[in-house]
């Protein structure tokens, strides 16, 4: 290389990461094997769980505003789970990104898209609950499945917009030991006249903005919504939290516990530009907290089922239906198409936020499954007795 050939400019923290070499330590190898196994299992679970949730909520339940929120959350988690196998492969080949720069950008973007989408959707769910209790008349007139879908689309657009910088500044960097990193390279585009200053300002901007937009602001919205709802319900003398409240609380708690450590380490990493002493802590901690953040997508479907007994019932029924359809004789499928039911209108008013945890009557047998396979996820339009009974005092 000639004396004047400027090497690919890297921020100091990134260049130091590229200098870290792999150990052939036996105990470290065992940890790597365990990590590959754990992530592989999480990939499989995440894909299956979120796929099942999408099917059950989208096709086996009456469509309400609440099921719309859960559908979009599950979609976000499914996307994240779909990217986990590639992260598992990265671990399996010795922490080296062998899938190219474009896929590095896409894979990382999915992680951040899920981060923003989850935060935004949880905020929307909380605001939705708040509006129902604080402005019940307005909610009665404006809370429609169609409106909820539109809000979700806007939130997805915002999430995509916030993900753009992570797509732009993601890069593959060759390490000195031959491995390849898929990581931030904030000098990738227009490094400016002073690279050190650019490194510091951009890393801080990315860390602080994602902490605020994807974590602190959503949690603040969730907390203030919960406070407003609690105050209003205290006046009504309502004590016991509804099932949907338990579900939201569980999902929000999982979100905070899974993403909190990631944001702490992300902020530490930004600080490490000016304070190299923090770098070893960040290098050791970030892989763990990133995995923890990924596992949020695997945890959510479990929480939906655990906090919602009716979901479990529908899940059992759906799985039985699938098995029946697999084992059924061809002749039994003759008139299946005629038994399909129409989905309720997307503009229908949502009776209650408890629709997710209600018990509508379900059509049985393989006919229902075939209807779904042919493209119409029929959902029973009836409102369950529990749903009707609590529609006026939902929380």
């Amino acid at each position: 290389m000639s004396a004047n050939a400027t090497l690919k400019p890297l921020c100091p923290i990134l260049e130091q990461m590229s200098r870290l070499q792999s150990h052939s330590n036996t105990s470290i190898r065992y940890i790597d094997h365990a990590a590959v196994l754990l992530h592989g299992l999480a990939s499989l679970l995440g894909l299956v769980e979120n796929g099942v949730i999408l099917f059950v909520v989208g096709c086996r339940m009456r469509q309400t505003v609440v099921t719309t929120w859960v559908l979009h959350l599950a979609l976000s988690d499914l996307l994240a789970s779909a990217s986990l196998p590639f992260f598992t492969y990265f671990l399996a080949v010795g922490h080296s990104w062998e899938l190219g720069t474009t896929f590095c950008k896409l894979h990382s973007s999915i992680f951040f898209l899920n981060m923003f989408a989850s935060g935004f959707l949880l905020s929307a769910i909380s605001l939705d609950r708040c509006l129902q209790v604080v402005r019940p008349v307005w909610a009665q007139n404006h809370r429609t499945v169609a409106a909820a879908h539109k809000v979700c689309l806007v939130l997805w657009a915002l999430a995509v917009l916030n993900t753009v910088p992570y797509f732009v500044f993601r890069d593959t960097i060759s390490r000195l030991d031959g491995r390849i990193m898929c990581y931030y390279n904030v000098l990738l585009l227009n490094p400016g006249p002073d690279r050190d200053a650019t490194c510091n300002s951009r890393q801080v901007a990315l860390a602080v903005s994602k902490f605020l937009l994807a974590f602190l602001v959503p949690l603040a919205i969730i907390a203030s919504s919960h406070a407003a709802v609690s105050l209003r319900l205290q006046h009504r003398g309502r004590r016991r939290p509804g099932r949907f409240v338990r579900l939201v609380a569980a999902v929000v708690a999982a979100f905070a516990l899974c993403w909190g450590p990631y944001h702490v380490f992300s902020l530490l990493e930004a600080r490490a530009h000016a304070n190299p002493g923090l770098r070893p802590l960040v290098w050791r901690g970030l892989p763990f907290v990133t995995s923890l953040a990924f596992f949020n997508s695997v945890a959510n479907p479990v929480l939906y089922v655990l906090t919602c007994p009716d979901m479990l019932r529908k899940l059992r029924r759906s799985l039985r239906t699938v098995l029946e359809s697999v084992l059924v004789d061809d002749s039994e499928l003759g008139g299946a198409g005629s038994s399909r039911r129409r989905r309720t209108s997307s503009t229908a008013r949502s009776a209650s936020p408890l629709a997710l945890c209600s018990r509508p009557e379900e059509p049985r047998g393989p006919a229902r499954l075939l209807g779904w396979l042919l493209g119409s996820c029929a959902a029973s339009p009836q409102t369950g007795p529990l749903n009707r009974a609590l529609s006026s005092t939902s929380s």
Partner: antibody
Amino acid sequence: EVQLVESGGGLVQPGGSLRLSCAASGFTFSSYKMSWVRQAPGKGLEWVAVISNGGSTTDYPGTVEGRFTISRDNSKNTLYLQMNSLRAEDTAVYYCARHRTNWDFDYWGQGTLVTVSS
Amino acid sequence: DIQMTQSPSSLSASVGDRVTITCRASENIYWNLAWYQQKPGKAPKLVVYAATQLADGVPSRFSGSGSGTDYTLTISSLQPEDFATYYCQHFWITPWTFGQGTKVEIK
């Protein structure tokens, strides 16, 4: 060919000031971090100051902090070291060095001798 | 500040000998180490960077190794032009300090 030429060294009294210059050529000066390193007669090397490629970030060891100031003029391809409150222990050959990337001095000047004596 | 301790401070060797110089840091420097060669009256010259990487134009008889706090510069077969003083320097946390040097002399 990369060239770094230091100038401005000489004899100065304790407490006095001196400004060293380093003229760079043969490479895109504004793309590289630069440092000053000194070597007392018959002794080892000591890093003295670093400046980022754009000049906004500087750093110094405790031995010279507050007394020495590193600066650069990218339009003139020149690196400077302003030395104030000089002491006898500052007597050394001062080298300017180019950073390979963020670290590692891949090119050095021939050095300029600074003698602090009364 | 991180202290860099080089050993030996001087050594006598013959052409063709294998020479090993070690450098110990007072704390982990994560491969952020460079080796320089300096001949009398001349400016230092970069030999190895990032603990293990050979600088441009440096013969392959030179090699760097190590991790954590202990690093080594090895000359597999000493040549007449290799007689000089060698310095290690860390680039972990400022101030970036040098070792006191190892003088390689002709036996």
